[in-house]
Every structure is written in structure tokens, then in C-alpha cells.
């Protein structure tokens, strides 16, 4: 092909090539042709004669102003036609008359200001029709019932001001899964406008400047339709009352999005006519108060997002948003509640009362006065089968004993990114019988004791990254009770002292993050009492990260019996000469990182076993000694391996001898090394 298109598996990509005409030298069996972002003005039907197998043609982002009806005659199998971002202004009855097999037609961002006659009447198989970002002033797409298989009609970002039954009833035999009318300034919903559509399941009217009165009118027009999903985000629904959604009483609405409405006042009973609702988003609003009847009637709600839903605190304390006790009492089937990013002062004794099905509760950056968690904080969750609790970013500084005693079914507890500074007695976790993960990373200061985790033997994941961890070297180890632990993160704590029994008994440990600590002394031969082998017995360890620990020695036998190790990261240390056979048990290793050390020599008796099944190797930025003794085996291995070694040409450079300084390792000529082998032997004799 003389064109610079790339062709693979019957797909031709000719995008971004400044083409002014359709290439005539592509394989005739292509089924997908991408001609986007070129300079095509026309699509002569004759040019497509040779590509009769096309099922998808994308000519978006060109300057096409007219379509030849014969185009689709040449492309009888075409299913997807994308004409977005062109200069089409008029469609006639003939434009798509031969495109009878189309399932998707994309016409967004053209200049189609009016649809005359019936240009889509032959598209009996069309599923998606996208006319968004045009200048359409009405929804009129034809004069007779058509498009019976249409599921998605996208009309966002047009100039539609009224929805009229006489325009929408061409869809009398259609089941629209999605009618997208967002970013139109709708001012009128004529009587029966939605009833005329065969079935309408989802209506999106985001950014349509709907006020409470228009919203109420809209809901009445949706009465007795099949509507299930209604999205009214980014409108002007400043307040809701019992009448706002009353028209939806005779629907089975399951999803409602009211985000970004500057909603201030949620009147009592606002949702009382929505008993089928399962998903409600009130994100990014300005709610001042929730009262015990705010959510009345939402007896089937499963998901509620109140992320940044409340008014932001101003100078006046009176502006603090308020969640009255029992505000959630009606939500007996609610499973997921998100209250992130708010300014709620704190919990009250009955804040969450009634949420008897709640499983996931996210309270990240929710509270302004929750510095101390007490055994009263979550009392209102006592009857909730909570599985996940997110308490990040709340400026929590202390956890009192029994704080979580109400949450016997909790599996995941996230306390990260707070300001906790305390000694962990272990009583903080009392009652967490089923806990699976505790995330405590990024807090101020945690002092461990032997009993810190004695009450949570079910724990499988414990994250203690960057918490200025103290007392890690106590005996018995604080982690001794955690027989089920599979992930332990102790990174970024500047730990310098640990005992050999730190991880004793953690036979199920699979991931150990120990990077950014200070273990150098512990692995020195000169260490009093000898090197500390804290990895012994971790027979199921898969991933080990010891990056940035100042290590300049690896003791013999430290990795012995760690047969299941798949990844070792020893990068950013000071390792130079590694003892032979230290990696002999790591034949299952898939990833090895030794970047930015002081390694000069890569020899078979050290690296032969771990290199056997390696997928990825990172030894960049080491000062390699480019002599036969030091690297000939490595260079030969590099040149025949399938292992991924990124930046091999640029970041694996010789440091010595002087005349090889800066020379790419992989270009080192090893042929003379082999020749000299017999002479070496003779010299030894």
C-alpha cells in the first residue's frame, strides 16, 4: 500500500494522514475503515466499490458537506457509519436510503438545522442515532412511524425548546432505551409528548435549565410511561417538594440523578412517589438540612450518593449543614451510601438508624468535628450489616476502645489519610470479628504493642505505610496473631530495628511492602548476632518490596525456601557484589528490580536461577563493568531472552573499564570472551 494506512486483521486505520481522497490501494477484504481526521470533502461512491465487505466506516472529523446515496449501494454490509464533525447541512430522503443494514449512525457535530421529510425511514435496523451538537430546533425526524428498532436517540446540545407529541410519535413502535436531550433549553413539554413513544426507558435532560415548575410538568408527562432512568443533573432545581416528582407515581422509575442542581431545600416527602427507586444521586448540591421525612417513601432505594451534597460551611456557624436523627430511617433496603466531601459536624446517636441493609458506607472527608472516634460515634450503625467503611480524610486523631464494636460484620475499614497518633492497644478493634482489611496508611504516629491486633485474627490485609511506626521490634511480634494475613504494608516508616520473629507464623503472607525503611544494618554480616532473617518461613510470599532501604549486602540464605516469589524489588539500594546462589530458590520469579544499585557484575551463579522464567527485568542505572568476567554471560542472556527489559539501549551502560564508559551494554562483543576461555584454563595450570 502506497498510503500510510496501517492494516491489521481486516481493519484499516487511515486516520490523521491529511488525505484528500479515499485510498484506492487497501486490501479488498477490509471490514473496518477509519478515515477520521483527514481533509476529505466528498466520499465518491465509486471509490468504495473495492471495499464492499465494510461493516464499519468512520469518516469523522473531515469537511464532508454532501453524501452520495450510492455510497451505501456499494457497501451493502455496512452497519456502522460515523460522520461526526463534518459539514453536512441537509439530509434528504435519499441520503441513507440504501443504508438498510445500519445499526449505528453518528451525525453529531454537523450543521443539520432541520430534518425534512423522512431521511431515516429505511433504517429499520438502526439501534443508535446520534444527532447531538447540531443546530436542530425541534425533535421532528420524520412524518411517519419509523425506526422501530431504535434504542438510543442522542439529541444533546441542540436548540430544541419544546417537546411535542406530534414530533415524537414517529417512535410509536420503538423501545427507546435512551433519549438524550441534555444541553437543550427545554421550555415546554406538550401534553402526551412521551406517551407517544412506544417505550421510553431512559431520559437524560442534564443541563436543560429546568426549574422546579418545569420539572414537575416533565414528571407528569412521564406518568404512565416505561421510564426507568431519569437524569436531571446540572439544572436549576433549587428546591423539591412533595409535588415535584408526584407525576412519577405511575411509573417504575429506578434511577434518578439530581446532581449539580444547587439544590438547597429537600422538602418533606419529596420522594414519596418513588417507591421503585433504587439509585438516587444528590451529588454536588447545596442541601442545608435533611429531616426525618426527607427520604420518606424510598422504600426500595439501594444506592444513595450524597457526595458534596450539603452546603459548604461559611463564616456563620449557622450555615453548618444538619442531618437530623432518623433522616435515613425509611431506607431499609439501602446498601450503598456515599457522603464524601461534606461539612457535617459529626455523627449523632441516630444518624444512621434504620439502615438495616447498609453494606457500604463512605465517609471520606465528611466530618468537620470527628477528631476522636468514640464507642458512640457509630452506635446508630449497630443494626446495619456494614461490610465496608471509609473514614479517610477526616482529621481523626484518636480511636477510642470499642469504637467499632457495633460493626461485627465489617470486612474493610479504611482509616487512611487521617492524623491518628496513638498507641494501639488492640481494644480499638474490639468486635471486628469478620474484618478482612484495615487500612491505616498515611497517619501521624502509631505505636504498636504485642496486642495491637490480637482481637482481629481474621485480618488478611494490613496497611501501615508512612505512619511513623514505633515498637515494631517488640517481642512477641505485634503481627503474631494475624495467621491469615496475606498483605502487609510497612513501607515508608524508617524502620531500623526488627526482630527475626517479626513475621513469624505468617505462612499465608503473599505481599510484603517494606520499601523506604532503613534495614541496611540488619542484613550486614557484621550485625551483632548476625544478619536478621525476618523472611524465614514466608513460604507463600509472592511479592517482596525492599526498595530504598540502604542495603549493601544480602545475606546468604535470606531468600531460601521462598519458592513462590514472583516479584522482588531491591531497587534504589547500595548493592554491589551479590553472593553466589542467593536466588537459587527463585526459579518462579517473574519480575526482578535492581535498578539504581552499585552492581558491576552479573554472573550466572547469582542470576542464572532467577532469570529462568523472568517476564520483566529492571537493572537500569547500575555501573556495569564491561569485562568478560563481569558481564559476558549477562550480555549473551540479554541477546537471546524474551524477558522485557525496558530502556535497554539507553540505561544499561558500561561504567568501567574507562574506554567502555557510556557504551551500551547490549553492544558489548562477547565473541572474544569465548575464544579466550581455553587460554585462561592453560594459564591456571
Amino acid at each position: 500500500s502506497t498510503t500510510k494506512c496501517t492494516v491489521s486483521h481486516e481493519v484499516a486505520d487511515c486516520s490523521h494522514l491529511k488525505l484528500t481522497q479515499v485510498p484506492d490501494d487497501l486490501p479488498t477484504n477490509i471490514t473496518v475503515l477509519n478515515l477520521t481526521h483527514n481533509q476529505l470533502r466528498r466520499l465518491p461512491a465509486a471509490n468504495f466499490t473495492r471495499y464492499s465487505q465494510l461493516t464499519s466506516l468512520d469518516v469523522g472529523f473531515n469537511t464532508i458537506s454532501k453524501l452520495e446515496p450510492e455510497l451505501c449501494q456499494k457497501l451493502p454490509m455496512l452497519k456502522v457509519l460515523n460522520l461526526q464533525h463534518n459539514e453536512l447541512s441537509q439530509l434528504s430522503d435519499k441520503t441513507f436510503a440504501f443504508c438498510t443494514n445500519l445499526t449505528e449512525l453518528h451525525l453529531m457535530s454537523n450543521s443539520i438545522q432541520k430534518i425534512k421529510n423522512n431521511p431515516f425511514v429505511k433504517q429499520k435496523n438502526l439501534i443508535t442515532l446520534d444527532l447531538s451538537h447540531n443546530g436542530l430546533s425541534s425533535t421532528k425526524l420524520g412524518t411517519q412511524v419509523q425506526l422501530e428498532n431504535l434504542q438510543e436517540l442522542l439529541l444533546s446540545n441542540n436548540k430544541i425548546q419544546a417537546l411535542k407529541s406530534e414530533e415524537l410519535d414517529i417512535f410509536a413502535n420503538s423501545s427507546l432505551k435512551k433519549l438524550e436531550l441534555s444541553s437543550n433549553q427545554i421550555k415546554e413539554f406538550s401534553p402526551g409528548c412521551f406517551q407517544t413513544i412506544g417505550k421510553l426507558f431512559a431520559l437524560l435532560l442534564n443541563n436543560a435549565q429546568l426549574n422546579p415548575h418545569l420539572t414537575e410538568k416533565l414528571c407528569w408527562e412521564l406518568s404512565n410511561t416505561s421510564i426507568q432512568n431519569l437524569s436531571l443533573a446540572n439544572n436549576q432545581l433549587l428546591a423539591t417538594s412533595e409535588s415535584t416528582f408526584s407525576g412519577l407515581k405511575w411509573t417504575n422509575l429506578t434511577q434518578l440523578d439530581l446532581s449539580y442542581n444547587n439544590l438547597h431545600d429537600v422538602g418533606n416527602g419529596s420522594f414519596s412517589y418513588l417507591p421503585s427507586l433504587r439509585y438516587l444521586s444528590l451529588e454536588y448540591n447545596n442541601i442545608q438540612r435533611l429531616s426525618p421525612r426527607s427520604f420518606y417513601g424510598l422504600s426500595n432505594l439501594r444506592y444513595l450518593s450524597l457526595k458534596r451534597a450539603f452546603t459548604k460551611q461559611s463564616v456563620s456557624l449557622a450555615s453548618h449543614p444538619n442531618i437530623d436523627d432518623f433522616s435515613f430511617q425509611w431506607l431499609k433496603y439501602l446498601e450503598y451510601l456515599n457522603m464524601d466531601d461534606n461539612n457535617i459536624p459529626s455523627t449523632k446517636s441516630n444518624t444512621f438508624t434504620g439502615l438495616v441493609s447498609l453494606k457500604y458506607l463512605s465517609l471520606s472527608k465528611t466530618f468537620t468535628s470527628l477528631q476522636t472516634l468514640t464507642n458512640e460515634t457509630f452506635v446508630s450503625l449497630a443494626h446495619s450489616p456494614l461490610l465496608t467503611l471509609n473514614l479517610t480524610k477526616n482529621h481523626i486523631s484518636k480511636i477510642a476502645n470499642g469504637t467499632f464494636s457495633w460493626l461485627g460484620q465489617l470486612r474493610i475499614l479504611d482509616l487512611g489519610l487521617n492524623e491518628i497518633e496513638q498507641k494501639l492497644s488492640g481494644q480499638e478493634w474490639r468486635g471486628l470479628r469478620n474484618i478482612f482489611e484495615i487500612y491505616l496508611s498515611y497517619n501521624k504516629y502509631l505505636q504498636l504493642s504485642t496486642s495491637s491486633f490480637a482481637l482481629v485474627p481474621s485480618l488478611q490485609r494490613l496497611m501501615l505505610r508512612r505512619v511513623a511506626l514505633k515498637n515494631v521490634d517488640i517481642s512477641p511480634s505485634p503481627f503474631r496473631p494475624l495467621r491469615n494475613l496475606t498483605i502487609l504494608d510497612l513501607s515508608n516508616n524508617n524502620i531500623a530495628n526488627i526482630n527475626e520473629d517479626l513475621l513469624e507464623g505468617l505462612e499465608n503472607l503473599e505481599i510484603l511492602d517494606f520499601q523506604h525503611n532503613n534495614l541496611a544494618r540488619l542484613w550486614k554480616r557484621a550485625n551483632p548476632g548476625g544478619p536478621v532473617n525476618f523472611l524465614k518461613g514466608l513460604s507463600h510470599l509472592h511479592i517482596l518490596n525492599l526498595e530504598s532501604n540502604g542495603l549493601d549486602e544480602i545475606p546468604v540464605g535470606v531468600f531460601k525456601n521462598l519458592f513462590e516469589l514472583k516479584s522482588i524489588n531491591l531497587g534504589l539500594n547500595n548493592l554491589n557484589k551479590l553472593e553466589p546462589f542467593i536466588f537459587d530458590d527463585q526459579t518462579s520469579l517473574r519480575s526482578l528490580n535492581l535498578q539504581k544499585n552499585l552492581i558491576t557484575s552479573v554472573e550466572k551463579d547469582v542470576f542464572g536461577p532467577p532469570f529462568q522464567n523472568l517476564n520483566s527485568l529492571d537493572m537500569r542505572f547500575n555501573p556495569f563493568d564491561c569485562t568478560c568476567e563481569s558481564i559476558s554471560w549477562f550480555v549473551n542472556w540479554i541477546n537471546q531472552t524474551h524477558t522485557n527489559i525496558s530502556e535497554l539501549s539507553t540505561h544499561y551502560l558500561c561504567n568501567t573499564p574507562h574506554h567502555y564508559y557510556g557504551f551500551p551494554l547490549k553492544l558489548f562483543d562477547t565473541s572474544s570472551c569465548k575464544d579466550s576461555a581455553p587460554f585462561e584454563l592453560l594459564f591456571i595450570i
Epitope: 434528504s92 430522503d93 421529510n117 411517519q144 412511524v145 407529541s165 406530534e166 410509536a172
Partner: antibody
Framework: QVQLQQSGPGLVKPSQTLSLTCAIS??????????WGWIRQSPGRGLEWLGI?????????NYAVSVKSRITINPDTSKNQFSLQLNSVTPEDTAVYYC????????????WGQGTLVTVSS | QSVLTQPPSVSVAPGQTARISCSGD??????VHWYQQKPGQAPVLVIY???ERPSGIPERFSGSNSGNTATLTISGTQAEDEADYYC??????????FGGGTKLTVL
């Protein structure tokens, strides 16, 4: 086989209302695959379209600009017929009037009534 | 399509090809239908959607349409083809626009 049978008076006085009916057999006036309309032909002149009705969720009509203020076309679903009313007739309205079935999607007339000569005279 | 223009008359010898034109601004973008009307009778559809022939219409009738002109072609014209011929199209809200008609005379 679709048949259209026209009926109505052949003589109408000026200023009165011309009324014609078109009875349908072999199809339904409420069909959503066809539309129904009236055409006339003045003596020695060409064909002139008068108006059309079609059913979607409700009935819609379109009338020729030349008669828009005087014409009404109505369906009668119970009798499976449709009618033409033309008010305030003048001798200029003397013509042969045809009812017709328009076939979707592009409105060709595949069936015509037999035609009725209506004379407007006092 | 507000105006369709036809020649008032066309003459053709029997067995020859008759061509009747129908011109209108950008008529090629619209579907054109052709009707035959014999004296004292209602019109009959002979070509629809530019070039389609209804059942029962002889094969000698064909149609084409592009640019600003649609054409009805009768090849091997017979005496019985003598009639008035009307082209027509639709353009919402005018659901029918007729040409002025062409009288075909078979010599």
C-alpha cells in the same frame, strides 16, 4: 386488493360546502403504512393536490396552501372512510375530485378513487 | 419541491423511445413518481421512487432522476401509451407537488 369508492353530490351552489366521502375496502383508514388524501383536476387542467391525513399516535393533516383556509379532511374509523369538506366554494372549484391512498415511505399514490365531477353553479 | 416543470407535449413514432422530462431545483435529492392518465379515467402509477415499476406495468416504462431533472422513458412506445403523464414528488408540508403534465402523442 384495495378499492376506493367515492360518493357525494355532483352539483354544489356557490358559497356552499362541497362534501365528498371515500369508502375504503381492502385496507384500514387507521393504517400506519399509508396516508389518505384528495386531488382535483379542473377541466382541461392538470392535477392539483388538496390535502392528506395520516395516523400516528393521533391524526395529522396537511393541506395545500391554496385551499388551507377552507378545507377539512376527516377520518371515520367506524365506517373505514374519510371525507372532504371544502367551504365557500366558487365556480373555480369546479373539477373532478379524486380520493387516493398514499403509500409509505415516499408518498406515491398507488390507488385512486374513480373520481367525482363536482360542478359549482347556481 | 415547490415547482415541477414538464414539457406540455411530446410526440413519438410507434416503436421509438419517448422521453418525458420533469425539472425542478435539486430534484435529484427527492423521490419522483410518475402517473399516466387516459381521458375520462383516474391516473395510474407507472413509476415510483424514481425508477421502481409497480406490478402490472410493462417493462418498457423506466425512470431516472439526478441533478435537476427526472426522466420517464418509454422504450418501444405503443399506441396504447398515448396519455397524459404527470410527475410528482413530496416535500413536507406539501405532501404532493405535481408537474403540469405532458401530453404524449404516438404518431
Amino acid at each position: 386488493q384495495v378499492q376506493l369508492q367515492q360518493s357525494g353530490p355532483g352539483l354544489v351552489k356557490p358559497s356552499q360546502t362541497l362534501s365528498l366521502t371515500c369508502a375504503i375496502s381492502g385496507d384500514s383508514v387507521s393504517s400506519n403504512s399509508a396516508a389518505w388524501g384528495w386531488i382535483r383536476q379542473s377541466p382541461g387542467r392538470g392535477l392539483e393536490w388538496l390535502g392528506i391525513i395520516q395516523k400516528r399516535s393521533k391524526w395529522y393533516n396537511n393541506y395545500a396552501v391554496s385551499v388551507k383556509s377552507r378545507i377539512t379532511i376527516n377520518p371515520d374509523t367506524s365506517k373505514n372512510q374519510f371525507s372532504l369538506q371544502l367551504n365557500s366554494v366558487t365556480p373555480e372549484d369546479t373539477a373532478v375530485y379524486y380520493c387516493a391512498r398514499y403509500s409509505y415511505p415516499f408518498y406515491s399514490i398507488d390507488y385512486w378513487g374513480q373520481g367525482t365531477l363536482v360542478t359549482v353553479s347556481s | 419541491q415547490s415547482v415541477l416543470t414538464q414539457p406540455p407535449s411530446v410526440s413519438v413514432a410507434p416503436g421509438q423511445t419517448a422521453r418525458i422530462s420533469c425539472s425542478g431545483d435539486n430534484i435529484g435529492s427527492y423521490y419522483v413518481h410518475w402517473y399516466q392518465q387516459k381521458p375520462g379515467q383516474a391516473p395510474v402509477l407507472v413509476i415510483y421512487e424514481d425508477s421502481e415499476r409497480p406490478s402490472g406495468i410493462p417493462e418498457r416504462f423506466s425512470g431516472s432522476n439526478s441533478g435537476n431533472t427526472a426522466t420517464l422513458t418509454i422504450s418501444g412506445t405503443q399506441a396504447e401509451d398515448e396519455a397524459d403523464y404527470y410527475c410528482s414528488s413530496y416535500d413536507d408540508p406539501n405532501f404532493q407537488v405535481f408537474g403540469g403534465g405532458t401530453k404524449l402523442t404516438v404518431l
